[in-house]
Amino acid sequence: DLKVEMMAGGTQITPLNDNVTIFCNIFYSQPLNITSMGITWFWKSLTFDKEVKVFEFFGDHQEAFRPGAIVSPWRLKSGDASLRLPGIQLEEAGEYRCEVVVTPLKAQGTVQLEVVASPASRLLLDQVGMKENEDKYMCESSGFYPEAINITWEKQTQKFPHPIEISEDVITGPTIKNMDGTFNVTSCLKLNSSQEDPGTVYQCVVRHASLHTPLRSNFTLTAARHSLSETEKTDNFS
């Protein structure tokens, strides 16, 4: 009996530019002889429904149809037919199929590969055209993929034990696609500093599929309206 097992859940998520290993494990009732077996990896793009050969291994012959693709012969001996792809790109997301032949038996498994890019975040103070005691803080998130992103603003006052989500005076712009396929977006918070308590911490919170925990950039309102620290005066408040 020949069986192939892929990543549990049927989906693997990998960061952009990572050296990804797409898992494929072979289970066979007898010891594997790699000279009399074959491994072929196929890829089907998210946009085209056509399957393309990525890598093949037959006996003493192996060929990478995607530059850098490799299946380790040493690991193959112990049943590990995982495919390593260095420098994975966004457009390489899709369905990967691992096909194993141990004559006369054949087994296969498929996995969806998702490529994600984590956003970078920076906080900027824009005072151009603002009224007295009014400030506009901009939270820029850039270089993320996929497009879905959630940006919220929170404040933490001195007195209350938990943060508070701010919903008023927040405008989040449309996402903009970059040349490399990643996205950028900016969210703005308008603050009337005369109505806020000094010592209140404001935070831009970015949640995205690529992040285990939210990305946070913060600033603290001081008694003097514009007394931001030097690091805050540049770009990054985090």
Epitope: Q156, Q158, K159, F160, P214
Partner: antibody, heavy 117, light 107 residues
Framework: QVQLVQSGAEVKKPGASVKVSCKAS????????MNWMRQAPGQGLEWMGG????????DYNEKFKGRVTMTVDTSTSTVYMELSSLRSEDTAVYYC??????????WGQGTLVTVSS | DIQMTQSPSSLSASVGDRVTITCKAS??????VAWYQQKPGKAPKSLIY???NRYDGVPSRFSGSGSGTDFTLTISSLQPEDFTTYYC?????????FGAGTKLEIK
């Protein structure tokens, strides 16, 4: 990292007073507000009051007004909660708690105060 | 004072179950609600703030929802360590008030 270390367990007679301390470390002490909570055995949580750690202001639960006093010693980064005219129903675990960051708020380990004749 | 009415007071469930705990505020508290988990002999640990935001490090199986007066804490797939007591808390105004708690027990 932030730590709130409270004083040890106390046994008091009815009518007496108790003073529980909470020593803070790992952050700029005076820029925070400290709350005090209590929990009677097998019961829920109850907010008693809070104090701004620069010592500027306090806010007490009406239920405890006149019996509770919260003070700060900034030189030792310690906050105190004193409860007077103790009765048996004041038997509880008393906690000091500080506003959190993004892993949640910080709590002391608790101080058990037993009021018994 | 704002009353927080939590239900049920106790709940029996099995590992892997999905459970929901509700909390009703006596007046509008917006989204100023937090949820705590408390294990026996330990200080409470905060799970959720602003009704629906998980604190960093809290497993994704915990989720909160609601606004105004009605709030829920949902545990999507119970793990053995989740069988303990949960409290809601409003923090829109002083005095801070808590629900009476929900004890989650193994069926």
């Amino acid at each position: 990292q932030v730590q709130l270390v409270q004083s040890g367990a106390e046994v008091k007679k009815p009518g007496a007073s108790v003073k529980v301390s909470c020593k803070a470390s790992g952050y700029t002490f005076t820029s925070y507000w400290m709350n005090w909570m209590r929990q009677a055995p097998g019961q829920g949580l109850e907010w008693m009051g809070g104090i701004y750690l620069s010592g500027e202001s306090t806010d007490y639960n009406e239920k405890f007004k006149g019996r509770v006093t919260m003070t700060v010693d900034t030189s030792t980064s310690t906050v105190y909660m004193e409860l007077s005219s103790l009765r048996s129903e004041d038997t509880a675990v008393y906690y000091c708690t500080r506003r959190g960051d993004y892993f949640g708020d910080f709590w002391g380990q608790g101080t058990l105060v037993t009021v018994s004749s | 004072d704002i009353q927080m009415t939590q239900s049920p007071s106790s709940l029996s469930a099995s590992v892997g179950d999905r459970v929901t705990i509700t909390c009703k505020a006596s007046q509008n508290v917006g989204k100023y609600v937090a949820w705590y988990q408390q294990k026996p002999g330990k200080a409470p640990k905060s799970l959720i703030y602003s009704a629906s935001n998980r604190y960093d490090g809290v497993p994704s199986r915990f989720s909160g929802s609601g606004s105004g007066t009605d709030f829920t804490l949902t545990i999507s797939s119970l793990q053995p360590e989740d069988f303990t007591t949960y409290y809601c808390q409003q923090y829109i105004s002083y005095p801070l008030t808590f629900g009476a708690g929900t004890k989650l027990e193994i069926k």
